[in-house]
Interface confidence: low
């Protein structure tokens, strides 16, 4: 074609995949009459007519372009939609008149890939491997043209380096025509590479300029043998008897080397295997005092059965002894003294305090009580409570009971229960002394007695209300070695509507809806307005 | 009653191979690391070579290693060594022994009365 | 790693010998002690901090300080007349290592 050797280069066109491209016949009038041109696409040097344009109308030729060629801007410009990877060719217009003149355009076709999908090799890689090892692929799908890829490591790029860093790129046509990157970066690592953050970066164009996609960051499993194992106590801080205490094996290496936990045995000082639960954790719940010891972790490496031990630990777990109170059953006279001594080991510095058991008064701050003048109301609880200040929730308790020789005295001297005429009544009397008294009553009745601590009794009697009980009243008498006393409860009617009968002199109340030889409750120990207690 | 009983001693050449047992009784042999201990004639006594309970683990002197197997057969409560490219210093009486492994020491609590290797031309 | 032992002592009959054993594993581990007889296996005597295996008399006994442990007969007798070696785990913990042995003779 006479002054081919002078042709401009072909105008570039740039579009993406899919879309349409725009192919705008270059020539001038005086080139050619833009009504009477021949479209043709040159695919290995190969030309082949595509499309004719005359009198302005255009026409698409049989073949792969058919369905997708139109005419645009009164003709000058062609229009190919959809377009594919396989569409990056030149194409050319020729003019026919006044003499046959052609114009070139170059059709660059860009896909940008899919976000790359890296995988870590599952397996992880020995730091004392002879040469590089798989660490991750990068797979990214769907480009064109082929994307450019590069590996990061910590944020920084990865370059080629002999015996160190191999990067193994490879890539595959999909029927699409787009291309599917495949790109294994081997390596060499190292222990300190175990967190090491790895990702990569695809590279591409796009007719609006150049892009980058990157993946997501993955830690490779790396393997380096155990140097140091070590042991690990929670909770921290110090232990006393009842926690739980776990003791672990921890260990540099990975993976973990097999641990047995051992705890020396102290008259012989030999190592005693403790048995740990499936996590190889030596869980002591409640500990005790016997768990205190010196541990030690041993890390057996299976595959080269190397054995790491580590630093012994010792244990403390806390602990206060069953407290002990001397004398241990006291009993005294009205009048005389009495010292309580209370002991206690532990394995700290110990806290003594004294307390009244009814009232939870403190009375002495330390391993000595003492009472003087002794009198009746001195008698019952006393508690020593031995505890460790620095470590709260140490601590064990004593009951001691004091007893007062003396003759029974009674809860109340007399009482009134209001009742109902053939109900069937629960009283209840209660002494105290020393010796413990036994109570009788002076009505038929069933009774029922029940030590309520070393020195009282409480006596209940069922009693079916009677007129001649009501005239009676009903007596309760307390009796030990020392002597008796009585108390006596009055017997009162009341009506059903009586609520509450007039407050000065009632001291009990029994309103009850229950018919004749039915239960109604009216105890003496069951006060609506408080009524000092009387002594007998 | 705890008892070793070692066998499998005798005369052999410089390079040959032989092999000792040591049959136990009267514990749970399972239970205990095994030994074996050698001495040589009017010398003292050398530590020769290991095996854990469950013979998972072994171990040698840096004298015999390459050279020297310790197995262990617990249904046969039976320990073995078997030694190959025998020398002339490995002539000794060869003990095996109870080893009662500890964190803080190792005791050969038992001993059998010994079986006589040597090795000469 | 070695364990050092004197070759020899004597002692007279009734009076009280010392037995050393030196080593740099004797700072980790304690030693074993071992008796042996002329054409007998060797029986141990004592082990660990202080321990006496049942049936050996209790004028046998052990002690430890740094890298030296030590075996006391106190009274000796004319039937404690014998070889004795200390044993111990070396430094790797998985090597035992014997002292060269102590010939006690009884005067």
């Known amino acids: 074609v006479p002054g081919e050797a002078e042709q401009p280069a072909p105008e570039l066109v740039e579009v993406e995949v899919g879309s349409t491209a725009l192919l705008k016949c270059g020539l001038s009038q005086s080139q050619g009459n833009l009504s009477h041109v021949d479209w043709f696409s040159v695919h290995k040097e190969k030309r082949t007519l595509i499309f004719r344009v005359r009198q302005g109308q255009g026409q698409s030729e049989p073949g792969e372009y058919e369905q997708r060629l139109s005419l645009q801007d009164r003709g000058a410009t062609l229009a190919l939609t959809q377009v594919t990877p396989q569409d990056e060719r030149i194409f050319l217009c020729q003019g026919k008149r006044p003499r046959s003149q052609e114009y070139r355009i170059q059709l660059r076709v860009y896909k940008a890939p899919e976000e790359p999908n890296i995988q870590v090799n599952p397996l992880g890689i020995p730091v004392n491997s002879k040469e590089p090892e798989e660490v991750a692929t990068c797979v990214g799908r769907n480009g064109y043209p082929i994307p450019q890829v590069i590996w990061y490591k910590n944020g920084r790029p990865l370059k080629e380096e002999k015996n160190r860093v191999h990067i193994q790129s490879s890539q595959t046509v999909e029927s699409s025509g787009l291309y599917t990157l495949q790109s294994i970066l081997k390596a060499q690592l190292v222990k300190e590479d175990k967190d090491a953050q790895f990702y990569c970066e695809l590279n591409y164009r796009l007719p609006s300029g150049n892009h980058m996609k990157e993946s997501r960051e993955v830690t490779v499993p790396v393997f380096y043998p155990t140097e140091k194992v070590w042991l690990e106590v929670e909770p921290v801080g110090m232990l006393k008897e009842g926690d739980r205490v776990e003791i672990r094996c921890l260990a540099d290496g990975n993976p973990p080397p097999h641990f047995s936990i051992s705890k020396q045995n102290p008259s012989t000082r030999e190592a005693e295997e403790e048995t740990t639960n499936d996590n190889g954790v030596l869980v002591l719940e409640p500990a005790r005092k016997e768990h205190s010891g010196r541990y030690e972790c041993q890390g057996l490496d299976l595959d080269t059965m190397i054995s790491l031990l580590s630093e012994p630990q010792e244990l403390l777990v806390n602990y206060v002894s069953d407290v002990r109170v001397s004398p241990a059953a006291p009993e005294r006279q009205e009048g005389s003294s009495l010292t309580l001594t209370c002991e206690a080991e532990s394995s700290q510095d110990l806290e003594f305090q004294w307390l009244r058991e009814e009232t939870g008064q403190v009375l002495e701050r330390g391993p000595v009580l003492q009472l003087h003048d002794l009198k009746r109301e001195a008698g019952g609880g006393y508690r020593c409570v031995a505890s460790v200040p620095s470590i709260p929730g140490l601590n064990r308790t004593q009951l001691v009971n004091v007893a007062i020789f003396g003759p029974p005295w009674m809860a109340f001297k007399e009482r009134k229960v209001w009742v109902k005429e053939n109900m069937v009544l629960n009283l209840s009397c209660e002494a105290s002394g020393h010796p413990r008294p036994t109570i009788s009553w002076n009505v038929n009745g069933t009774a029922s007695e029940q030590d309520q601590d070393p020195q009282r009794v409480l006596s209940t009697l069922n009693v079916l209300v009677t007129p001649e009980l009501l005239e009676t009243g009903v007596e309760c008498t307390a009796s030990n070695d020392l002597g008796k006393n009585t108390s006596i409860l009055f017997l009162e009617l009341v009506n059903l509507t009586t609520l509450t009968p007039d407050s000065n002199t009632t001291t009990g109340l029994s309103t009850s809806t229950a018919s004749p030889h039915t239960r109604a409750n009216s105890t003496s120990t069951e006060r609506k307005l408080p009524e000092p207690e009387s002594r007998g | 009653e705890v008892q070793l009983l070692e066998s499998g001693g005798g005369l052999v050449q410089p390079g040959g191979s032989l092999r000792l047992s040591c049959a136990a009784s009267g514990f749970t042999f399972s239970s205990y690391a095994m030994s074996w201990v050698r001495q040589a004639p009017g010398k003292g006594l050398e530590w020769v070579s290991a095996?854990?309970?469950?013979?998972?683990?072994?171990y040698y002197a840096d004298s015999v290693k390459g050279r020297f197997t310790i197995s262990r057969d617990n249904s046969k409560n039976t320990l073995y060594l078997q030694m190959n490219s025998l020398r002339a210093e490995d002539t000794a009486v060869y003990y095996c022994?109870?080893?009662?492994?500890?964190?803080?020491?190792?005791?050969?609590?038992?001993w059998g009365q010994g079986t006589m290797v040597t090795v000469s031309s | 790693s070695e364990l050092t032992q004197d070759p020899a002592v004597s002692v007279a009959l009734g009076q009280t010998v010392r037995i050393t054993c030196q080593g740099d594993s004797l700072r980790l581990y304690y030693a074993s002690w071992y008796q042996q007889k002329p054409g007998q296996a060797p029986l141990l005597v004592m082990y660990?901090?202080?321990n006496r295996p049942s049936g050996i008399p209790d004028r046998f006994s052990g002690s430890s300080s740094g890298s030296t442990s030590s075996l006391t007969i106190t009274g000796a007798q004319a039937e404690d007349e014998a070889d004795y070696y200390c044993s111990s785990r070396d430094t790797s913990g998985n090597h035992l290592v014997f002292g060269g042995g102590t010939k006690v003779t009884v005067l």
């Open positions: 095996i854990s309970g469950s013979g998972g683990s072994t």
């Open positions: 660990g901090k202080s």
């Open positions: 022994a109870r080893d009662v492994y500890g964190a803080t020491s190792s005791v050969f609590d038992f």
